[in-house]
Each structure stands twice: as structure tokens, then as C-alpha cells.
Interface confidence: medium
């Protein structure tokens, strides 16, 4: 591919109530013949790049963020890289980046507001 992977997230912040679950939506467009073995997906805090969740080498590497995050494994192959953040806390508020690498890479940031 000559261009970066196109990663799409909602423009508007995701608003969640304390204690509820929030879905940080992120999607990419898989090319024909794409397989999950090619995918490197990294969710990180935008400002510090602290690792939140990752998927690589064909498998979910799990949560690195207080064990409160999950991917949607059945939807990854279709380009759905969304992250589920459970039991939202006030301290979770901020920007999360979805970083997708297949051969090239792309990233986009989604904001979480806690009410």
C-alpha cells in the first residue's frame, strides 16, 4: 500500500456516566485477503502513550489498563477495533488513541468525557 491505514473514530467525545461501561469506537478498512495475523492494534492514552490494550500476532494480548478493557474479537476481522472500557471512573477522562498497523499504519484519537 502506498498510503497509511485509514483509521476512523467519532468526532464527538464519548460521554459516559461514572460506573457504567463505555465503547470507544474505532474502525479501519481491511484490504482483500486481510487476516488477523497481520494486525497490530494498540490502544494507548494519547498524551502519555501508556498502553491500554493490544492485539498482535493473531491474538488479544489483553488489558494493560486495570483489567477494565476489552476488544470485540468477533468483529476485528471486519475492521472493528473498538474498545470497551468497563466501570468508567472520573480518572479515565481524556483522549485515547487507536493505533492500527497492518503493513503501513494509521491512528486516530477519541475523547472520553465522564459525567
Amino acid at each position: 500500500p502506498t498510503g497509511a491505514v485509514e483509521v476512523q473514530v467519532p468526532e464527538d467525545p464519548v460521554v459516559a456516566l461514572v460506573g457504567t461501561d463505555a465503547t470507544l469506537r474505532c474502525s479501519f478498512s481491511p484490504e482483500p485477503g486481510f487476516s488477523l495475523a497481520q494486525l497490530n492494534l494498540i490502544w494507548q492514552l494519547t498524551d502519555t502513550k501508556q498502553l491500554v490494550h493490544s492485539f498482535t500476532e493473531g491474538r488479544d494480548q489483553g488489558s494493560a489498563y486495570a483489567n477494565r478493557t476489552a476488544l470485540f474479537p468477533d468483529l476485528l476481522a471486519q475492521g472493528n477495533a473498538s474498545l470497551r472500557l468497563q466501570r468508567v471512573r472520573v480518572a479515565d477522562e481524556g483522549s485515547f488513541t487507536c493505533f492500527v498497523s497492518i503493513r503501513d499504519f494509521g491512528s486516530a484519537a477519541v475523547s472520553l468525557q465522564v459525567a
Epitope: 497490530n40 498502553l51 498482535t56 500476532e57 499504519f105 491512528s107 484519537a109
Partner: antibody, heavy 116, light 108 residues
Framework: QVQLQESGPGLVKPSGTLSLTCAVS?????????WNWVRQSPGKGLEWIGE???????NYSPSLKSRVTISIDKSKNQFSLKLNSVTAADTAVYYC?????????WGQGTLVTVSS | EIVLTQSPGTLSLSPGERATLSCRTS???????LAWYQQKPGQAPRLLIY???SRATGIPDRFSGSGSGTDFTLSISRLEPEDFAVYYC?????????FGQGTKVEIK
Amino acid sequence: QVQLQESGPGLVKPSGTLSLTCAVSGGSISTSNYWNWVRQSPGKGLEWIGEIYPTGNTNYSPSLKSRVTISIDKSKNQFSLKLNSVTAADTAVYYCARGWNWFDPWGQGTLVTVSS
Amino acid sequence: EIVLTQSPGTLSLSPGERATLSCRTSQSINGILLAWYQQKPGQAPRLLIYGASSRATGIPDRFSGSGSGTDFTLSISRLEPEDFAVYYCQQYGSSPRTFGQGTKVEIK
């Protein structure tokens, strides 16, 4: 295909300020990427200096933080490095690079010598 | 900060031989947070491997990466003349991002 090109003076006097600019072509600097500066002293390894996000958020190496400023000019599709109070130890090849995590691509590098 | 230690410092091999380069991190990191670069004299580093094992665009399959935790390896299955260079590992699991000191692969 994103390409990066460093420019700036090749000679800086001790105690002066090193100023470099990195021009980004083939893509927008406003995309969700960090834009980095890395340096390599003669015959030595690579040292990350710092990075800037299009929003203006910056992260710097703790060892250089007190002397470094990285800025971004989205209208010119470029970002810049300023390193003040330089000494001979700051003589190095300075590279700019795109990278959220790993660095790719890199500029070709520019040698900056600190000498009177 | 996370310190990366590469070994050996220099590897003297002949074309066609296998090269095995080691990178050890001072703290355990997720493998997705490690990259390898190749640098030839007078050139900028070139990304080879990211995520510990994924080859960057255009990198031949004789290059492979592996490892987890604190121990990572870059392997070159059969050295070609153009592979003689310095190789660096880099972690991006925490700030500041740091590099190893490099391993020089030279012709024996």
C-alpha cells in the same frame, strides 16, 4: 509517501541555541501522529530528544527537557527543534522522524557542530 | 527509564551465515512495544521490525524478530552483502523512548 527533510545551521557557537526545522511532504502534519527529533553523536548510538502531536502536546527526554522546545507549524507543514545552552556534547547528526511508537520514515539527518 | 542492552557489540560473520542479535530490556515490556532498525554508514536508520515480530514494508523475509518480556531477538537467516550494518532495538513502552547501543554486523 511521507518524506521528511531537516534544515538549519550546521554550526552553532557554545552557549548558543541550536535551531532546526523539519519539512513534511507527501502527507499532512495534522494527522494523528507524533513528530519526533532523534540525534546521534559521532560514532555513538541513537538518542530520542522529544516529540510533538498536532494539538501541540509535547513530550521530552528528561535529560534534555530543561533545554528543549519543539513546536509545530501546521500552515507550513513543518515542525521545529530548539535546543539552548549548547555545548560540544550536543554535536550530533539530528534526525526528524514520524512515529507514534516506532519511527518511520526518517529524514536524512543534518550534522550540527557546536564550536566557536 | 528502560535501558536496552544489545549483545554482542560486534558480530563477525560471512555472507550466507545466520545472524542472531539480542536485545535485553531492564524491565519487562509487552512485545508489541519493541522495534528494530538497520543503519548503514552515512544513512538514517531504517525500520525493520515493529511489534517485536512484524516486518516493515519492503523488508525481506530473511529478517525476523521474536521475544517477549525482557528478551528479544533479531535474526537474519542468510546474510546478504547489503545486510552488513549496525542494528538497533528500541522500546516504546514507556517514556522516554530508548534505544539499545547497537550491534555491528561486519564481514568476517
